[in-house]
């Protein structure tokens, strides 16, 4: 894991962090899959989008997500040495005007239509984990990550850096 001893140590500052620029430093159109190579797919049902985690049939096209990367500066750290920590934050948009949102009350991940500036619930701190995996931590709820539960995306509490490598919060990004 890329984290530190005690996930909360640096994520505590997330609530107070600010996105340093209103425009992303870079964007990347990619398909999103789980550690076990199940695809994250998005389906329009009854005028709202549903998010699924499923095995695709051979040659079935993967859904793409636009990842927009932002820098977030959080306040001077607790040790008082005055050095700010720079984090990489991301928003995920599978289709125009829709973004993944963290619903912390329901512990769910939802697709919401919204205008910019995006609410904090649409921002996730990007963690590099294994060589080819990333995790997404809620900006609004430090220590809570997007994860897989019962073939759906859900919000999963991670209480220590040892658990940052649990497979259900690891995702792969791919151009194909």
């Amino acid at each position: 894991a890329f984290g530190i001893s005690g996930v909360q140590k640096y994520t505590r500052a997330l609530h107070d962090s600010s996105i340093t620029g209103i425009s992303p430093i870079t964007e990347y159109l990619a398909s999103l899959s789980t550690y076990n190579d199940q695809s994250i797919t998005f389906a329009l049902e009854d005028e709202s989008y549903e998010i699924y985690v499923e095995d695709l049939k051979k040659d079935e096209k993967k859904d793409k997500v636009l990842l927009s990367y932002y820098e977030s500066q959080h306040p001077s750290n607790e040790s008082g040495d005055g050095v700010d920590g720079k984090m990489l934050m991301v928003t995920l948009s599978p289709t125009k005007d829709f973004w993944l949102h963290a619903n912390n009350k329901e512990h769910s991940v939802e697709l919401h239509k919204c205008e910019k500036p995006l609410p904090d619930q649409a921002f996730f701190v990007l963690h590099n984990m294994h060589s080819n995996c990333v995790s997404f931590e809620c900006k609004t709820d430090p220590g809570v990550f997007i994860g897989v539960k019962d073939n759906h995306l859900a919000l999963i509490k991670v209480d220590s850096s040892e658990n940052l490598c649990t497979e259900n919060i690891l995702f792969k990004l791919s151009e194909t």
């Epitope: 140590k9 640096y10 040495d81």
Partner: antibody, heavy 122, light 107 residues
Framework: EVQLVESGGGLVQPGGSLRLSCAAS????????LTWVRQAPGKGLEWVSF????????FYADSVKGRFTISRDNSKNMLYLQMNSLRAEDTAIYYC???????????????WGQGTLVTVSS | DIQMTQSPSSVSASVGDRVTITCRAS???VSWLAWYQQKPGKAPKL??????SLQSGVPSRFSGSGSGTDFTLTISSLQPEDFATYYC?????????LGPGTKVDIK
């Protein structure tokens, strides 16, 4: 001010061992990943090894895999590189550097030490 | 492993010149590419990260562009302190790899 100071370099015979240290200050040490990069005399930079802030799974260049071990002591703000079975081609200045971002390695490395010279020769 | 190539390997230029260095990755690295400057006997210095983001304290005459496999570092008006060797580095996946360097010297 961020400071990284390497030490432990010197002359060692082929097959020998050496332990490099990097003392860090001016930032929250445990929040950042660290890396070792080396530079043979008159040559370019070569990435050697990487370790996360928590000291979790390390990564190594193929050229040093199985011979070098990266580790860190977050209570002492220290980074180490244990080098065994040294070869002439390991002769280089070894730099330690810290990651730009706290949770991601994507940004590269924004602060570097001045390096320590390792010479492997009989 | 991802191979990084740089061109030219060296360039002779005068103060005030516009200098362009290119870096190519053997496979896509998204935008996760950094540029470093190194002067003789000194440690490398981060200039550009995420392909085009200027590191704090670096003069605005330095700029970066590109994504995927092809990247460019541009010095819009070369200054005396810019004569150095420049390296690109991909940080998209392990092992991290660096280009062989481009030496910028005085014409």
């Amino acid at each position: 001010e961020v400071q990284l100071v390497e030490s432990g370099g010197g002359l060692v015979q082929p097959g020998g061992s050496l332990r490099l240290s990097c003392a860090a200050s001016g930032f929250t040490f445990s929040s950042y990943a660290l890396t070792w990069v080396r530079q043979a005399p008159g040559k370019g930079l070569e990435w050697v090894s990487f370790i996360s802030g928590s000291g979790g799974r390390p990564f190594y260049a193929d050229s040093v895999k199985g011979r070098f071990t990266i580790s860190r002591d977050n209570s002492k703000n220290m980074l180490y590189l244990q080098m065994n079975s040294l070869r002439a081609e390991d002769t280089a200045i070894y730099y330690c550097a810290k990651s730009l971002y706290t949770t991601s390695w994507y940004g590269g490395f924004d602060s570097w030490g001045q390096g320590t010279l390792v010479t492997v020769s009989s | 492993d991802i191979q990084m190539t740089q061109s030219p390997s060296s360039v002779s230029a005068s103060v005030g010149d516009r200098v362009t260095i290119t870096c190519r990755a053997s496979q896509g690295v998204v935008s996760w590419l950094a540029w470093y400057q190194q002067k003789p006997g000194k440690a490398p210095k981060l200039l550009i990260y995420a392909a085009s983001s200027l590191q704090s304290g670096v003069p605005s005459r330095f700029s970066g562009s590109g994504s995927g496999t092809d990247f460019t570092l541009t010095i819009s008006s070369l200054q005396p302190e810019d004569f150095a060797t420049y390296y690109c580095q991909q940080s998209n996946s392990f092992p991290f790899t660096l280009g062989p360097g481009t030496k910028v010297d005085i014409k």
